[in-house]
């Protein structure tokens, strides 16, 4: 399908790898049914300004991830950040661009928060 990048592998990381019985890091091949889409994801925490990756890997078919070429978290200050995307290794880099809520305009311009990159 034109304009759709298939995900065949994702960067894999698991901070809790021992308990979860997985590898700690690597590349994860994303297999699946022909009618199902596969995505890459990243989850991380912001501990006092320091980025701590929790998990990265393949993500099951999820409409919220469709046609996203970049891995971007848009929620404002979540406890656990999450992003998903489509395309090989698209979760190698991830960023945070919170969507500003549409409110009454103020006299002071709002500066968007800076993104975080891996």
């Amino acid at each position: 399908i034109l304009g759709r990048s298939e995900t065949q592998e994702c960067l894999f990381f698991n901070a809790n790898w021992e308990k979860d019985r997985t590898n700690q890091t690597g590349v994860e091949p994303c297999y699946g049914d022909k009618d199902k889409r596969r995505h890459c994801f990243a989850t991380w925490k912001n501990i006092s300004g320091s980025i701590e990756i929790v998990k990265q890997g393949c993500w099951l078919d999820d409409i919220n991830c469709y046609d996203r070429t970049d891995c971007v978290e848009k929620k404002d200050s979540p406890e656990v950040y999450f992003c998903c995307c489509e395309g090989n290794m698209c979760n190698e880099k991830f960023s945070y661009f919170p969507e500003m809520e549409v409110t009454q305009p103020t006299s002071n311009p709002v500066t968007p928060k800076p993104p975080y990159y891996n």
């Epitope: 809790n16 393949c58 993500w59 099951l60 919220n64 979540p78």
Partner: antibody
């Protein structure tokens, strides 16, 4: 079709052990983890742990550590859950459930359940 | 361990009603949340995974929303076969934990 078939009901005495089997069919056995969940009469669901069929590694809930053993036989696509030192509180329905290796790891196929009754 | 708190514990509703069940995690679990339906004497059945993704074969009247700590399962128009107990479950960190369940009963 994808199916998990569990062994039949068991009645055990306190202090004994029980071994429940779960035979998988209709999919590649080693491509999915197998988790075990139990449900006491009239109660909710309680996660017990899982086994990775490809390598046999396991992870158990702390509550069952030392009493539960999960094994697998790849030649028959069967996983086993053995619970020892049984007590009356272990009376429950025990379920196996298939879980994708991929996040967010839902339990998408369940066995029919095995009733284990612990009574003196 | 992450605690999952479901509310209400039971709800009485009629066919055609809109039913909403909530689930709260004691700490952030991002979108690592699934919803299951269980009927008496039967195994649980997966309805929703990744907080909002509908499992194959599940009717579209079921929907899930939320992320972080607060999640919702909605049945838009209750059908006779929907009277059952519903459980939320987190898979973000071990041990995996379930909510206490919500029984949907006939009014």
């Amino acid at each position: 079709q994808v199916q998990l078939v569990q062994s039949g009901a068991e009645v055990k005495k306190p202090g004994a052990s029980v071994k429940v089997s779960c035979k998988a069919s209709g999919y590649t056995f080693t491509s999915y983890r197998m988790h075990w969940v139990r449900q006491a009469p009239g109660q909710g669901l309680e996660w017990m742990g899982f086994i990775v069929p490809s390598g046999g590694s396991t992870s158990y809930a702390q509550k069952f550590q030392g009493r539960v053993t999960m094994t697998r036989d790849t030649s028959t696509s069967t996983v086993y859950m053995e619970l020892s030192s049984l007590r009356s509180e272990d009376t429950a329905v025990y379920y196996c459930a298939r879980v994708s290796m991929y996040a967010p790891e839902p339990m998408d196929v369940w066995g029919q359940g095995t009733t284990v009754t612990v009574s003196s | 361990d992450i605690q999952m708190t479901q509310s209400p514990s039971s709800v009485s509703a009629s066919v055609g009603d809109r039913v909403t069940i909530t689930c709260r995690a004691s700490q952030g679990i991002s979108r690592w949340l699934a919803w299951y339906q269980q009927k008496p004497g039967k195994a649980p059945k997966l309805l929703i995974y990744a907080a909002s993704s509908l499992q194959s074969g599940v009717p579209s009247r079921f929907s899930g929303s939320g992320s972080g700590t607060d999640f919702t399962l909605t049945i838009s128009s209750l059908q006779p076969e929907d009277f059952a107990t519903y459980y939320c479950q987190q898979a973000f960190s071990h041990p995996w934990t379930f909510g206490g369940g919500t029984k949907v009963e006939i009014k």
